[in-house]
Interface confidence: low
């Protein structure tokens, strides 16, 4: 393993694009550690404010975690000659708040991208597609990890965060080959309706630890390859017939539903019936009611129709405040 560090100071690396020379095949950027044998470059926890320009051509795995990159501009990794081998790029926890269109262009082998733990106030619709064409060239991405990328409330744009992420995922239909998508811990209240239809190759979808209340308008029908659907730790109250039928129709899926506040009233009857006969829910015997109070902690699988009643709605004249 060779390593290089700044000889002058530990100040953040400031790349100068104007003076950038074609990288030598074996050089290692300042403040980074490089292993040609492992095809890996690590520039970790070095407070870098820009992506180093002089990355070695052999790099296959690039770790740029724990820095202060702030903005990822278009062509942030474009080099001449290109970084043709770069397959895995980890930018997690690097204080990114803006990822612009075309940020990952000219990375023909990029299969895995991790942007987790960056407070993305702005994610360009063309961050992954690279262009604003209605159908762009397919992205080589197979795994996209976007856990905890929600910005603090005071940094949010006017538009919904869910909508911003969705726009980037569907732009140009570029992510048709995506197998894995992680969107955990993003405070999502809903999943925009058409997102999953544009991601037909998904095998693994993680939406855990969000604030999803309902899946009524979400369609899983196209996801015939889906193997894992993680919905733990959301705000789901009940799954309705349409969703149950779609999940049952997926040939390989395993669904994870732990730690949701299930409401065990008359609307839950179909879901309980389905749970008793389905094989798709992992750990279904752990699912318990949260509401109403009289049903708290009851196991869903142990309920019968007599348990699942709805309080009659009183006519207005009998209602009290």
């Amino acid at each position: 393993t060779s390593s290089a560090s700044s000889s002058s100071s530990s100040a953040p690396f400031l790349a100068s694009a104007a003076s950038a020379q074609p990288p030598l095949p074996d050089q290692c950027p300042a403040l980074c550690e490089c292993s040609e044998a492992a095809r890996t470059v690590k520039c970790v926890n070095r407070n870098l404010t820009e992506v180093p320009t002089d990355l070695p051509l052999y790099v296959r795995n690039l770790f740029l975690t724990g820095n202060q990159l702030a903005v990822l501009p278009a062509g942030a990794f474009a080099r001449r000659p290109p970084l043709a081998e770069l397959a895995a790029l980890n930018l997690s926890g690097s204080r990114l708040d803006e990822v612009r269109g075309g940020a990952f262009e000219h990375l023909p082998s990029l299969r895995q991208l991790d942007l987790s733990h960056n407070p993305l106030a702005y994610l360009s619709p063309f961050a992954f597609s690279g262009s604003n064409a209605s159908i762009s060239a397919p992205s080589p991405l197979v795994e996209l990890i976007l856990n905890h990328i929600v910005p603090p409330d005071d940094k949010r744009q006017n538009r919904s965060f869910e909508g911003m992420v969705a726009a980037a995922l569907v732009a140009g239909r570029a992510l048709q080959g995506l197998h894995l998508l992680e969107l955990a811990s993003n405070h999502f209240l809903y999943l925009p309706r058409d997102v999953l239809a544009q991601l037909p190759s998904l095998r693994y979808l993680d939406l855990s630890n969000n604030s999803l209340v309902s899946l009524t308008y979400v369609s899983f029908r196209n996801l015939t390859h889906l193997e894992s659907l993680h919905l733990e730790d959301n705000a789901l109250k009940v799954l309705h017939n349409g969703t149950l039928a779609e999940l049952q129709g997926l040939p390989h899926v395993r669904v994870f539903l732990d730690n949701n506040p299930w409401v065990c009233d008359c609307h839950m009857a179909d879901m309980v019936t389905w749970l008793k006969q389905t094989g798709v829910v992992q750990g279904k015997d752990r699912l318990t009611c949260a509401f109403p109070e009289k049903m708290r902690n009851r196991v869903l699988l142990e309920l019968n129709s007599a348990d699942l009643d709805c309080d009659p709605i009183l006519p207005p004249s009998l209602q009290t405040s």
Epitope: R203, H225, E227, S228, P251, H252, V253, R254, G279
Partner: antibody, heavy 121, light 110 residues
Framework: EVQLEESGGGLVKPGGSLRLSCAAS????????MGWVRQACGKGLEWVSI???????YYATWAKGRFTISRDNSKNTLYLQMNSLRAEDTAVYYC???????????????WGRGTLVTVSS | GYDMTQSPSSVSASVGDRVTITCQAS??????LAWYQQKPGKAPKLLIY???DLASGVPSRFKGSGSGTEYTLTISSLQPEDFATYYC????????????FGGGTKVEIK
């Protein structure tokens, strides 16, 4: 009684092809995923392929491109077409039903007795 | 991905002994694991699925446990009919799998 019976095994030269069949009785194959598992003499079990209820297929990495799993629900039969056979494909090939309670790839709760495939010149 | 490593490859034990077999997955398989028993010249038999659920007709001396990447099959009191080879199998993913089964553990008479 639920039964699976494999057929089509035999001796084949390297580079040759063979088509295995698995006929089911006492079970409606269209309601289940089905798979093939093989076992070389004295060796362990090796997963080959699976076909879901909806005919989505998965293959072991080494089987992709050479083996093709298919089903004919009207005949209640599962197939495995094997091309470009090699000596290392010599094994007993089992057909098995994917359990209804299993996950993505699945578990196998009912097995046939197996059919022997020998690849040798 | 999802390679299964089983150990030990063989174990010698006596009737009444407690036997433990372990299986490690190269990635998290979320408890989607089965255990099979196979006797010479016979097809495998499903014992346990979803890491700890007993298949129909399987005696309660067989117990599965584990989560994540580490799983265990325990036979609490070995019976004469339990001498056989045992295999684990991940049921989680069919993508990029060389072999869904572990290498097997032969339980022999001491």
């Amino acid at each position: 009684e639920v039964q699976l019976e494999e057929s089509g095994g035999g001796l084949v030269k390297p580079g040759g092809s063979l088509r295995l069949s698995c006929a089911a009785s006492g079970i409606d194959l269209s309601s289940y995923g089905m798979g093939w598992v093989r076992q070389a003499c004295g060796k362990g079990l090796e997963w080959v392929s699976i076909i879901s209820r909806n005919s989505v297929t998965y293959y072991a990495t080494w089987a992709k491109g050479r083996f093709t799993i298919s089903r004919d629900n009207s005949k209640n039969t599962l197939y495995l077409q094997m091309n470009s056979l090699r000596a290392e494909d010599t094994a007993v090939y089992y057909c098995a039903r994917r359990a209804t309670y299993s996950g993505a790839l699945g578990y196998f709760d009912i097995w046939g007795r197996g059919t022997l495939v020998t690849v040798s010149s | 991905g999802y390679d299964m490593t089983q150990s030990p490859s063989s174990v010698s034990a006596s009737v009444g002994d407690r036997v433990t077999i372990t299986c490690q997955a190269s990635e998290n398989i979320y408890s989607t694991l089965a255990w099979y028993q196979q006797k010479p010249g016979k097809a495998p038999k499903l014992l346990i699925y979803d890491a700890f659920d007993l298949a129909s007709g399987v005696p309660s001396r067989f117990k599965g446990s584990g989560s994540g990447t580490e799983y265990t099959l325990t036979i609490s009191s070995l019976q004469p009919e339990d001498f056989a080879t045992y295999y684990c199998q991940q049921g989680y993913s069919g993508t990029n799998v060389d072999n869904a089964f572990g290498g097997g553990t032969k339980v022999e008479i001491k």
